[in-house]
């Protein structure tokens, strides 16, 4: 339905985001916000998989909200924007804005961690450990396990974070979690526990006495 | 309020000419495509014409090709029909409309009636 | 001969919902969205459903619009006197370079 038939030069993409956040808890208001370079006629959301758009909204300006009520985890999916002007012509619109995916849900998927190079080290080396989500922009928290505040944070524009772990204190077990950077806050389940050890120490546990 | 007022109706003989115009206002008319469309009596519509991209995209459709000519003067917020060539199936109530994707405004028409 | 295809009339009784349907191709309803307008006897054209689902202020929401495929369809429920009139899809169509509508449905509100 939506094809531009003229110079793409002439129908540039907007720009689509979402308020509070692109990951939400359910029953929240989500506001999705496109935003064109130019000032526009009209403004069309459209969810992926559906022809028709979801949403229109009529503005004459560069700037469209669309709002989702109380979303549910079915309103989740993958989103863009299009804009068009009043004289582009007949079913003429920009190009499609970036996708923005709109994950709603109460607990995020449980990230990976792993050690780089590996789990065993020589003694009085740096180790780093890969905390690994599938959505980017999150904040990261490594913990040791037996400690109850997390060793590091990191805010990653990643779908990932490597924390680093400096010489002798570095065998023990750990493991992390993230979460959304802002409020409303949606937290991940922690990861599985991953055991660091010095060479030839074989499975001593260093947790004991920290 | 957005309106939209034919006129240059009439009756003319097959063969003939006629200027049709249609007055806008209530909006920015040189922001707008435009198109006219016709209603042979007691028939279904039919689009006749539509102009684009202030005036650089111009579409008619096949039965008027050749004869008929849109135009438009965003100075004066009017568009234009300019017929030539006149035939009976071109009789007709001819009807201007705002066409920024659907003709979202209409006029209430003007009458062409092509007969000797 | 209309490029889009509609049954030439319908008809129900008050409170009831009707439906109506416009078949065309590729070229038009199925790469461009559907327009809906509604023509009361003796006026101009207004414009009541368009891209496919979508309602102007103002028109109530007992009009719906769908498209499936190369087809699209006009739905009244809760259908009233004042829905007598005739009802016209229209479509942009890429080969022809126009704009076409359907032969247009009048519809009667029976009874």
């Known amino acids: 339905d939506f094809t531009p038939t003229a110079p793409l030069a002439s129908y540039p993409q907007p720009w689509l985001g979402a308020h509070p956040a692109a990951v939400v808890t359910p029953g929240i208001n989500v506001t999705l916000t496109c935003r064109a370079p130019q000032s526009a006629w009209r403004f069309a959301l459209f969810k992926s998989g559906l022809v028709t758009p979801l949403l229109l909204r009529d503005v004459s300006v560069e700037l469209a909200e669309f709002f989702l009520e109380e979303v549910t985890p079915a309103q989740g999916g993958s989103y863009h924007c299009r804009y068009r002007k009043t004289d582009w012509g007949p079913g003429v619109w920009s190009q499609p804005s970036n996708v923005l995916e709109l994950l709603v849900t109460d607990q995020l998927p449980r990230p990976s961690l792993v050690a780089l190079p590996g789990p065993v080290v020589a003694p009085g080396a740096n180790v780093s450990l890969r905390c690994a989500g599938r959505i980017p922009g999150m904040s990261f928290a490594l913990y040791r396990v037996g400690v109850a505040t997390p060793l590091q944070y990191i805010d990653s524009v990643q779908p990932w974070a490597d924390f680093l772990l400096i010489g002798t204190h570095t065998p023990g077990t750990y493991c992390c979690y993230y979460h959304t950077p802002s409020a409303p806050y949606v937290l991940s389940q922690r990861s599985q526990p991953l055991v660091i050890s010095f060479e030839g120490s074989g499975s001593l546990d260093y947790t004991q006495g920290n | 309020e957005v309106q939209l007022l034919e006129s240059g109706g009439g009756l003319v003989q097959p063969g003939g000419s006629l200027r049709l115009s249609c007055a806008a206002s209530?909006?920015?008319?040189?922001?707008?495509?435009m198109s006219w469309v016709r209603q042979a009596p007691g028939k279904g519509l039919e689009w006749v014409s539509g102009i684009y991209h202030g005036g650089g995209n111009i579409y008619y459709a096949d039965s008027v090709k050749g004869r008929f000519t849109i135009s438009r003067d965003n100075s004066k917020n009017t568009l234009y029909l300019q017929m030539n060539s006149l035939r009976a199936e071109d009789t007709a109530v001819y009807y201007c409309?705002?066409?920024?994707?659907?003709?979202?405004?209409w006029g209430q028409g003007t009458l062409v009636t092509v007969s000797s | 001969q209309s490029v889009l295809t509609q049954p030439p009339s319908a008809s129900g009784t008050p409170g009831q919902r009707v439906t109506i349907s416009c078949s065309g191709s590729?070229?038009?309803?199925?790469?461009?969205?559907v327009t809906w307008y509604q023509q009361l006897p003796g006026t101009a054209p207004k414009l009541l459903i368009y891209?496919?689902?979508h309602r102007p202020s103002g028109v109530p929401d007992r009009f719906s619009g769908s498209k499936p495929g190369t087809s699209a369809s006009l739905a009244i429920s809760g259908l009233r006197s004042e829905d007598e009139a005739d009802y016209y899809c229209?479509?942009?169509?890429?080969?022809?370079?126009?704009?076409?509508f359907g032969g247009g449905t009048k519809l009667t509100v029976l009874g």
């Open positions: 891209y496919n689902s």
């Open positions: 409309a705002r066409a920024p994707d659907e003709f979202d405004y």
């Open positions: 590729s070229s038009n309803i199925g790469n461009n969205s």
């Open positions: 209530g909006f920015t008319f040189s922001d707008y495509a």
């Open positions: 229209g479509a942009w169509d890429s080969s022809l370079n126009g704009y076409v």
